[in-house]
C-alpha cells in the first residue's frame, strides 16, 4: 500500500482542516488508515483522524482544532496499521480556505433596488471575521450568458444594484463566496444560491 | 479540593537511587499534564520534568537528563520521579505541579496551578 | 534557553504603597496574541510556591485584584497596588512556552 499524491490540506480558520490524499490503489479509508496529528507545541499530545472515502483511492480527514493562531504547525503522519506510509506539516495560516457564507436573502421591495444580505460565515471574534470581502455572482436561468460577478471589496456583507441593471419579468439566482487578503487564501465555496422574480416599473419615456 | 500530595523523599548517597510519588486528588488527572520543579536549599525554584497527559510526551532538564525518569499511572492517579545515579547537587525540595490542559488539541494553559508540600530529598555520604 | 532576568532582587516597601517587580526574557515568549507563556509565583516562608498570574496577565483563582500583571513578548511586569504585610516572601517569574521552563532569580519582598 502507497502514496499516490501526498495529503494536501487547507484550514477554515476556525475548527477543521480538511486534508485530501490519493492512494495507489482502491482503499477502504475508514478501516485501513489512520492520519494522525499533533501540534508543535509544548506538552501537546498527538490526536487522530480516521478518514473516509473521496472516490476509489481517494481519502478525505477532517481535523478537528480548537481554533487557529498564525504560529500554529502541525505534525502528519499517515498510518496503515503499524507502517508509516508518509510524513509531513502543515501550517493552517499559510492554507485557508474560508467558510462559505451563509443566509444569502435578496430583497426586492426597495424602490427598484436589488438588496442581497448574507451572513459572515465566522463569529466577531475570529481574525477572519473582519477581513473577509465577497464575490456574488448573479445569473440568468434563461439565458447562460446573462452572468455576472459583482466583487464587494468593503466587509459589510451585503450588495445594493439597481433591479434595471438586470432584465425584467424573469428568474435570476444569486450565490456568494469569500475571501481574505490577509492571508492569501482561497476562494470558499459557494454559498447556497437563492432565486427570486426580477421586475421592475419601466420607466416612463417621455416624447 | 485539588490536591497533590508527594512522597518518597530521604537520604541517600551519591550514586544511588529514589523514587518519588504524587498522588493527584479533585481532578480528572489523565486530562494534564504534571510537572516536578526543585528547590536547593537556600536557592531558586529549578524546572526538572514534564509529563503530558497521556505519557506521551516527556522534556526534561539538561541537569537530570539520562538520570531521571518521570512517569505516571493515570490508573493510580500518580505521577513518579524515578532518579539514579544521584548527586550531592540534587540535594533539594522536590515538588510536583499540576500542569496544562493536555488533552486539547492546543493545551490550554493555566499556570502551575496546584502544588504539593515538597519532598525533601538530601544526598549526602 | 530562554533566560529570565527579574529586577530589583530585593524590594523594601512601606504597607499601602505599590510595588512592581520586573522580568525580562532573552527570547520572546509570545505564542500568539494575548498568548504571552510568563506566569509570576509567590514563595512565602516555609511554604510551596502559589500561582498568582498565568499568561502574562491572568489573575489565578483566589489571587487578590491587588496583584496585577502586564507586558508582552520580553517584557513583564507584577504590580502591587498595595503591600499587605502577608505579601512578603520570593517572587518569581517563569517561562513555559519552550522547554526547559526557566524561572527568575526571585525578588525578596520585605515590609520596611
Known amino acids: 500500500m502507497k502514496v499516490l499524491q501526498e495529503p494536501t490540506c487547507v484550514s477554515d480558520y476556525m475548527s477543521i482542516s480538511t486534508c485530501e490524499w490519493k492512494m495507489n490503489g482502491p482503499t477502504n479509508c475508514s478501516t485501513e488508515l489512520r492520519l494522525l496529528y499533533q501540534l508543535v507545541f509544548l506538552l501537546s499530545e498527538a490526536h487522530t483522524c480516521i478518514p473516509e472515502n473521496n472516490g476509489g483511492a481517494g481519502c478525505v480527514c477532517h481535523l478537528l482544532m480548537d481554533d487557529v493562531v498564525s504560529a500554529d504547525n502541525y505534525t502528519l503522519d499517515l498510518w496503515a496499521g503499524q507502517q508509516l506510509l508518509w510524513k509531513g506539516s502543515f501550517k493552517p495560516s499559510e492554507h485557508v480556505k474560508p467558510r462559505a457564507p451563509g443566509n444569502l436573502t435578496v430583497h426586492t421591495n426597495v424602490s427598484d433596488t436589488l438588496l442581497l444580505t448574507w451572513s459572515n460565515p465566522y463569529p466577531p471574534d475570529n481574525y477572519l471575521y473582519n477581513h473577509l470581502t465577497y464575490a456574488v455572482n448573479i445569473w440568468s436561468e434563461n439565458d447562460p450568458a446573462d452572468f455576472r460577478i459583482y466583487n464587494v471589496t468593503y466587509l459589510e456583507p451585503s450588495l445594493r444594484i439597481a433591479a434595471s441593471t438586470l432584465k425584467s419579468g424573469i428568474s435570476y439566482r444569486a450565490r456568494v463566496r469569500a475571501w481574505a487578503q490577509c492571508y492569501n487564501t482561497t476562494w470558499s465555496e459557494w454559498s447556497p444560491s437563492t432565486k427570486w422574480h426580477n421586475s421592475y416599473r419601466e420607466p416612463f419615456e417621455q416624447h | 479540593e485539588v490536591q497533590l500530595v508527594e512522597s518518597g523523599g530521604g537520604l541517600e548517597q551519591p550514586g544511588g537511587s529514589l523514587r518519588l510519588s504524587c498522588a493527584g486528588s479533585?481532578?480528572?488527572?489523565?486530562?494534564?499534564?504534571m510537572t516536578w520543579v526543585r528547590q536547593a536549599p537556600g536557592k531558586g525554584l529549578e524546572w526538572v520534568s514534564s509529563?503530558?497527559?497521556?505519557?506521551?510526551?516527556?522534556y526534561y532538564a539538561d541537569s537530570v537528563k539520562g538520570r531521571f525518569t518521570i512517569s505516571r499511572d493515570n490508573s493510580k492517579n500518580t505521577l513518579y520521579l524515578q532518579m539514579n545515579s544521584l548527586r550531592a547537587e540534587d540535594t533539594a525540595v522536590y515538588y510536583c505541579?499540576?500542569?496544562?490542559?493536555?488533552?486539547?488539541?492546543?493545551?490550554?494553559?493555566?499556570?502551575?496551578?496546584?502544588w504539593g508540600q515538597g519532598t525533601t530529598v538530601t544526598v549526602s555520604s | 534557553d530562554i533566560v529570565m532576568t527579574q529586577s530589583p532582587l530585593s524590594l523594601p516597601v512601606t504597607p499601602g504603597e505599590p510595588a512592581s517587580i520586573s522580568c525580562r526574557s532573552s527570547q520572546s515568549v509570545l505564542y500568539s496574541i494575548g498568548y504571552n507563556y510568563v506566569d509570576w509565583y509567590l514563595q512565602k516562608s516555609g511554604q510551596s510556591p502559589q500561582l498568582l498570574i498565568y499568561l502574562g496577565n491572568k489573575r489565578a483563582s483566589g489571587v487578590p485584584d491587588r496583584f496585577s500583571g502586564s507586558g508582552s513578548g520580553t517584557d513583564f511586569t507584577l504590580k502591587i497596588s498595595r503591600v499587605e504585610a502577608e505579601d512578603v516572601g520570593f517572587y518569581y517569574c517563569m517561562q513555559s512556552l519552550t522547554s526547559p521552563y526557566t524561572f527568575g532569580q526571585g525578588t525578596k519582598l520585605e515590609i520596611k
Open positions: 505541579a499540576k500542569d496544562r490542559l493536555s488533552k486539547t488539541i492546543r493545551p490550554r494553559y493555566y499556570g502551575l496551578d496546584v
Open positions: 479533585g481532578f480528572t488527572f489523565r486530562d494534564f499534564a
Open positions: 509529563i503530558s497527559g497521556s505519557g506521551g510526551n516527556i
